[in-house]
């Protein structure tokens, strides 16, 4: 029951997390104009991964897409890639985890197969969450660097007469959404991995055998020994761990693929 709850909760948390990652990726407020030095601006600038927007004094917001691909900063391209990889992995993870849910019966699927699928989806969620957190963190670092660079040459004088305030950008709402969503996806993935440990069928190493000693009619069942020493639980853990390690090795190929994105 606890395993089903852990798996179900892991799925729901990951689902919320991936929805958040998608939302963050689509949002326009990755960076917003810092109003500290210009609180009276009637023109408010903010930027996303795909377009930049300006809210004017009329309340009208005009957005312009980044219609160039080659002209964009490499860091922005990297952030886009990380977020998309996170979404794709998360979506595949969700698809896999639906079939892995203990509460859903699909034909005569073995519990061991469900355990492997749960672990696979869990690892996918973990990598997805890490991709989102990495993407948002790279963008945040980019903002901090640019912020202090623009602060250094804040005012560009025109013949020393007129001052033009350079627009500085600070953290937008999308960054916080991305961090939280990435964290949730990561937590959901860990929960799926934990649930996987309790999903594999319990296997006894010995069949119950009756030994007939001469003159006695006592049935000796080593299964009783298993329960008292905890040997069975060790066997269970070992069994799942071995299976888990194999699945984990298979999934390890994913991060290396990201190197080429």
């Amino acid at each position: 029951m606890a395993v089903t709850a852990c798996q179900g909760l892991g799925f729901v948390v990951s689902l919320i997390g991936i929805a958040g990652i998608i939302a963050a990726t689509c949002m326009d407020q990755w960076s917003t104009q810092d109003l500290y030095n210009n609180p009276v601006t009637a023109v408010f600038n903010y930027q996303g991964l795909w377009r930049s927007c300006v809210r004017e004094s009329s309340g009208f917001t005009e957005c312009r897409g980044y219609f160039t691909l080659l002209g964009l900063p490499a860091m922005l391209q990297a952030v886009r890639a990380l977020m998309i990889v996170g979404i794709v992995l998360g979506a595949i993870g969700l698809l896999v985890s639906i079939f892995a849910l203990k509460c859903i019966r699909i034909g005569s699927m073995e519990d061991s197969a469900k355990a492997n699928m749960t672990l696979t989806s869990g690892i996918m969620f973990i990598v997805s969450g890490l991709c989102a957190i990495a993407g948002v963190s790279v963008f945040a670092n980019m903002l901090v660097t640019n912020f202090w660079m623009s602060t250094a040459n804040m005012y560009t004088g025109m013949g020393g007469m007129v001052q033009t305030v350079q627009t500085r950008y600070t953290f937008g709402a999308a960054l916080f959404v991305g961090w939280v969503a990435g964290g949730l996806t990561l937590i959901g993935g860990v929960m799926m991995c934990i649930a996987c440990r309790g999903l594999a069928p319990e296997e006894t190493n010995y069949k119950a055998v009756s030994y007939h000693a001469s003159g006695h009619s006592v049935a000796y069942k080593p299964g009783g020994f298993k329960a008292s020493t905890g040997f069975g639980s060790n066997t269970k853990n070992k069994k799942i761990y071995d299976g888990g390690a194999r699945t984990e090795d298979e999934v390890q190929s994913y991060p290396s693929k990201h190197d080429y994105v």
């Epitope: 104009q33 210009n38 009276v40 601006t41 009637a42 023109v43 600038n45 930027q47 930049s52 300006v54 004017e56 004094s57 009329s58 309340g59 009208f60 005009e62 312009r64 025109m158 007129v162 001052q163 033009t164 305030v165 350079q166 627009t167």
Partner: antibody, heavy 115, light 113 residues
């Protein structure tokens, strides 16, 4: 057709208050701020402030803070400007303006403050 | 507050003449976010509300004759009427649309000889 229809002229006593209305039609009322502008006789235009019909948020020119209060009624797509403690300096034509770059203006409301 | 200075305060012209009026702002009206200058020009005829002519320094409003041209960047802006018509006689205001409080110039009055 987009229109901003303002209330009629008002002759007010010094110290009294007046409420001018501006009813918008022909566009999405909550999508654009309603700005208010004062034009004293033979003088330039002065921006009073704006109200966001979407959430009722306001911003005022410091000069008119305490003098003008902006409100909105979404159901009737009407914006209001309440001017208090009227003096002869408040005698002017008051305009409401909206849409991008103040594309549309009301016809103006003449407020005359006289004893 | 951004101060808008218009010159000349009045202009006396003959029909068909080319007219240029200027507007200077005390601070730059250039928004680095989209590289647009938030300077607006209005025309006001007696007894009427102002009418939008040009937004963002050079974008002519639809329905405005092409004899009206806006130019300039940063702090210096110009409104040019290539060939003045009788119906152009009015007061022309420039407006800072970049920073609160939004401010208007004192206006340039266009009169016929």
């Amino acid at each position: 057709e987009i229109q901003l229809q303002q209330s009629g002229p008002d002759l007010m006593k010094p110290g009294s208050s007046v409420k001018i209305s501006c009813t918008a039609s022909g566009y999405s009322f909550t999508s654009y701020y309603i700005h208010w502008v004062k034009q004293s006789h033979g003088k330039t235009l002065e921006w009073i402030g704006y109200i966001d019909p979407f959430n009722g948020g306001t911003r005022y020119n410091q000069k008119f803070e305490g003098k003008a209060a902006l409100t909105v009624d979404k159901s009737s797509t009407t914006a209001y400007m309440h001017l208090t403690s009227l003096t002869s300096d408040d005698s002017a034509v008051y305009y409401c303006a909206s849409l991008r770059f103040f594309t549309y203006w009301g016809q103006g409301t003449l407020v005359t403050v006289s004893a | 507050d951004i101060v808008m200075t218009q010159s000349p305060s009045s202009l006396t012209v003959t029909a068909g003449e080319k007219v240029t009026m200027t507007c200077k702002s005390s601070q730059s009206l250039l928004n680095s976010g989209n590289q647009e200058n938030y300077l607006t020009w209005y025309q006001q005829k007696p007894g009427q509300p102002p009418k939008l002519l040009i937004s963002r320094a050079s974008t002519r409003q639809s329905g405005v004759p092409d004899r009206f041209t806006g130019s300039g960047s940063g702090t210096d802006f110009t409104l040019t009427i290539s060939s003045v018509q009788a119906e152009d006689l009015a007061v022309y205001y420039c407006q800072n649309d970049y920073s609160y409080p939004l401010t208007f110039g004192a206006g340039t009055k266009l009169e016929l000889k």
